[in-house]
Each structure stands twice: as structure tokens, then as C-alpha cells.
């Protein structure tokens, strides 16, 4: 389903506010129809999407979302100002950075504006719902004849993240995994010069600043080592170019950059 963002034009039904602030959420006259679950994720603490399955409604319904924080200074109910739509029906809400307070209890309420007492409310700990961007700028340094060091960057959240490095050779059937703490560097002490290695990394907002369960996407992979016959000839050219970059630009120290950056370098 295609999802678009739209800012409401102000012609919102204001009756919902009355019910929201004066009516208990349950009474015997309330419809027994369940509301879809709202799932929220905070992307790199830059914005948050709270979404629901709009197609679970028996008939197309523009459900409305309100939210607030349990906060001494300001616990006012806020209306969603940027709805997400699926097939012209509300299916989510996007909150911007200034509206995100990771360490206050976030409360989100979904409501049927045609039947305002049909509402469902839940509390969320946003620090457990952060998903960082994938690690970037993977680089490999040869520390010694047989030792490699992998480094990477994360946008903004460095000390809050833990990482998972996966690597394999072209002879391996599966990845080898290694957990890495917030220092975002990984050493492979014993490298076989006859093999071609592939590395990738993902990150998670855990455990220093939150307890998120969700990992970022995997980084673009980075490669090291011998060429093999099964590889794409274009990659051979890129690798040859990499070697030139590392020897000329880095004074002989070998350093590889990620495929994304290589393609960028190749085309420019």
C-alpha cells in the first residue's frame, strides 16, 4: 500500500476533544468493535511513525490519533498534525523531532470520530522503540599481515548503540556474528589472504540509553581480499580502483570504503 503524508487542513471534527477530556473510555454503550493496534517507531530520534492497519476496519474509517506525555509541565492532549494515509484512509501519524520526548511516558490514543467513545489508549516507552539508521562509511584497515580492523559511523546516536558485525568468506555458507559495544570498531585477528571477506554491520539502541529490540537495517557490505572467478567483473574494476585509492590517497595504508561510496567514486 502506498503511504502519503498530509497535513490536516484544519477542518477537523472538534467533538472528539470533548469526549477525550470528559468521558471515561469505557461504558456499557461503547461499541464492542476492536480498534487496530497502534505501533510506533522512533527513527534515529529524527521522527516517529505511529501506524495502524486501516484495512482491519469493517468499513473505511478515518480513525483519529491523539497523544500526550505524562509530564509535569505539559500533559495536554495533542492532535496528530501529519497523518499518514493508505488508499485515502488514515493509517498513521508522523511526529517530528521536536514532538519526541524519549524519556517521558508517551500515551497514544486511537479513536473513531464517528463514535467517539470507541477509543483505545496505550502507554509506550519511546526509548525502547528507537530504530537507528544503518551504519555508514564502513572502512577496513590492515593492522598487520593477518589482522583487519573494521570501523563505521552512526549518525547522531553513537554512544547509545550496540552493534552486530557479520562477516563471511566466499567459501562460507553462513555468516559469523560478533557483538560490539558502543565503540563501533571490530578486529578480526586472523585473516586468510587467499579468501575474499565480506563484512556488514547493524546497530541497536541498547543498552545505555534504552532497551530497544529492533535493529537497524544492515549497512552496505564491504569486501576485503582475493578476487574469485565467481565475482562480477565490474567489481574487479572497482576493487582495482579501490587499491589505487588506498595506495595513492592514503600513503600506502590499505583502506577500503563501502560499496555505495565506491560506486559514487566510480561515477564521479
Amino acid at each position: 500500500l502506498n503511504t502519503t503524508i498530509l497535513t490536516p487542513n484544519g477542518n477537523e471534527d472538534t467533538t472528539a476533544d470533548f469526549f477525550l477530556t470528559t468521558m471515561p473510555t469505557d461504558s456499557l454503550s461503547v461499541s464492542t468493535l476492536p480498534l487496530p493496534e497502534v505501533q510506533c517507531f522512533v527513527f534515529n530520534v529524527e521522527y516517529m511513525n505511529c501506524t495502524w492497519n486501516s484495512s482491519s476496519e469493517p468499513q473505511p474509517t478515518n480513525l483519529t490519533l491523539h497523544y500526550w506525555y505524562k509530564n509535569s509541565d505539559n500533559d495536554k492532549v495533542q492532535k496528530c498534525s501529519h497523518y499518514l494515509f493508505s488508499e485515502e484512509i488514515t493509517s498513521g501519524c508522523q511526529l517530528q523531532k521536536k514532538e519526541i520526548h524519549l524519556y517521558q511516558t508517551f500515551v497514544v490514543q486511537l479513536q473513531d470520530p464517528r463514535e467517539p467513545r470507541r477509543q483505545a489508549t496505550q502507554m509506550l516507552k519511546l526509548q525502547n522503540l528507537v530504530i537507528p539508521w544503518a551504519p555508514e562509511n564502513l572502512t577496513l584497515h590492515k593492522l598487520s599481515e593477518s589482522q583487519l580492523e573494521l570501523n563505521w559511523n552512526n549518525r547522531f546516536l553513537n554512544h547509545c548503540l550496540e552493534h552486530l558485525v557479520q562477516y563471511r568468506t566466499d567459501w562460507d555458507h553462513s555468516w559469523t556474528e560478533q557483538s560490539v559495544d558502543y565503540r563501533h570498531k571490530f578486529s578480526l585477528p586472523s585473516v586468510d589472504g587467499q579468501k575474499r571477506y565480506t563484512f556488514r554491520v547493524r546497530s541497536r539502541f541498547n543498552p545505555l540509553c534504552g532497551s530497544a529490540q529492533h535493529w537497524s537495517e544492515w549497512s552496505h557490505p564491504i569486501h576485503w581480499g582475493s578476487n574469485t572467478s565467481k565475482e562480477n567483473p565490474f567489481l574487479f574494476a572497482l576493487e582495482a580502483e579501490q587499491k589505487l585509492i588506498s595506495e595513492e590517497d592514503l600513503g600506502g595504508e590499505q583502506k577500503l570504503i563501502s560499496e555505495e561510496d565506491l560506486h559514487h567514486h566510480h561515477h564521479h
Partner: antibody
Framework: QVQLVESGGGVVKPGGSLRLSCAAS????????IHWVRQAPGKGLEWVAL????????YYADSVKGRFTISRDNSKNTLSLQMNSLRAEDTAVYYC??????????????WGRGTMVTVSS | DIQMTQSPSSLSASVGDRVTITCRAS??????LNWYQQKPGKAPKLLIY???SLQSGVPSRFSGSGSGTDFTLTISSLQPEDFATYYC??????????FGQGTRLEIK
């Protein structure tokens, strides 16, 4: 009739398991967050766990984390608490309680009668 | 976690008395404070929510006040059915939810 009814309590040895249930009726169960709260004999109230209305957000007291699992079946209007690795200090009456929101404020407006769990060798 | 401390732990009073129970939070909880009444062998019953709002069906002799860290539950004229244990509960930093240790109100 609006009510919550707990069941499944009993006597169990330390290290054992028990599964409590809470049957709801008379309100829109599927749109309500539900909690477990316990009370040791002669003691005060202790919050145990919360499950959100649709069931995917779950929170636990530190004292039960990793041992207890809260779940719900909205199609059957039932709540469960799976209790593993039970300890003597888990001995208590266990209540399920419905969360209600009035404006931005939440409280427990409905409680079951409780079910007694005794952990003893 | 936020700690809730009630005082007194127990008190004796007579029918018709005005009774005040206090509850103190270890940090500011705005008005996220509820009061419950529990009688022996029974489940708790909500009396006051949001520090001062009377739950539907609860007699008006019960009232709540306070904000921040200090809260009070007042029973203006004690009735025989009011002898019970009373608990405060914060819902500000939730979860976890925390209760006070309880105040047992006995007949003098």
C-alpha cells in the same frame, strides 16, 4: 454484567509453574489495557504486569521479569499470566485490573476478586 | 522507580470524625495520583483519580487534593462502612506503577 474473574490459583512448589486466567465481560475488553496486581498475605498492593489493548506491548515489574509472561486473547476476552520459576515471595492473591483513561489520567476502575497463589515446599 | 510513602500506617477514628491520610511521592508526579479503598477479603475499589476527581458512585464525603509530591485523602465525616485500608498509587512514571504501603483505618 461488567466484571473480571480470575482463576488458576493454587499451591505449587518453589521452581514450579502456574498459569492464571482472567475472564472479562460487560465491556470492550479488546480496547482496554489490562494489568495484574498482587497482594501478599497481610501486605500491600504490588503491580506485576501490563498488556496493551492489542497485546503487543507488555511491561513487567523487575521482581517478575523473565519469569512471568502476560498474554491475552481478545477473541475470547481472556487474559493470562504464565508464572514460571516460582518463589516463596510470589505467594499472593493475584488480581487482574482494567485500566481506564479519563482525559490524560489513568487508573484501575475495575478489579477481579483475585485468585490465591501459594508457593511452598 | 518512584516511591510512594503513606502516613500514618494505621489510625483509629470514630464515626463522624474527619480523617486525613497523606501520601508523598519521591519525585514530582503532577496530578497522576489515585486513591483506592480495600476491605478485608475484597478487591480494591477506586475512590479518587487524578489527585482530586471523585470516581462515579463514590460518596462525596471522600475528597482528594495535592499536586507534585504531596497528596491527601480526606473523609469529611467517617461512616461505619469506611473502616478499611486505603492505598495511594502513582501513574505518572508508568510502567512500573507503584502503590503506597497502605493506611489501615480502624474503629476507635
Amino acid at each position: 454484567q461488567v466484571q473480571l474473574v480470575e482463576s488458576g490459583g493454587g499451591v505449587v512448589k518453589p521452581g514450579g509453574s502456574l498459569r492464571l486466567s482472567c475472564a472479562a465481560s460487560g465491556f470492550t475488553f479488546s480496547n482496554s489495557g489490562i494489568h495484574w496486581v498482587r497482594q501478599a498475605p497481610g501486605k500491600g498492593l504490588e503491580w506485576v504486569a501490563l498488556i496493551s489493548y492489542a497485546g503487543s506491548n507488555k511491561y513487567y515489574a523487575d521482581s517478575v521479569k523473565g519469569r512471568f509472561t502476560i498474554s491475552r486473547d481478545n477473541s475470547k476476552n481472556t487474559l493470562s499470566l504464565q508464572m514460571n520459576s516460582l518463589r516463596a515471595e510470589d505467594t499472593a492473591v493475584y488480581y487482574c485490573a482494567k485500566e481506564v483513561w479519563t482525559g490524560t489520567y489513568d487508573s484501575f476502575d475495575m478489579w477481579g476478586r483475585g485468585t490465591m497463589v501459594t508457593v511452598s515446599s | 522507580d518512584i516511591q510512594m510513602t503513606q502516613s500514618p500506617s494505621s489510625l483509629s477514628a470514630s464515626v463522624g470524625d474527619r480523617v486525613t491520610i497523606t501520601c508523598r511521592a519521591s519525585q514530582s508526579i503532577s496530578s497522576y495520583l489515585n486513591w483506592y479503598q480495600q476491605k478485608p477479603g475484597k478487591a480494591p475499589k477506586l475512590l479518587i483519580y487524578a489527585a482530586s476527581s471523585l470516581q462515579s458512585g463514590v460518596p462525596s464525603r471522600f475528597s482528594g487534593s495535592g499536586s507534585g509530591t504531596d497528596f491527601t485523602l480526606t473523609i469529611s465525616s467517617l461512616q461505619p462502612e469506611d473502616f478499611a485500608t486505603y492505598y495511594c498509587q502513582q501513574s505518572y512514571s508508568t510502567p512500573p506503577i507503584t502503590f503506597g504501603q497502605g493506611t489501615r483505618l480502624e474503629i476507635k
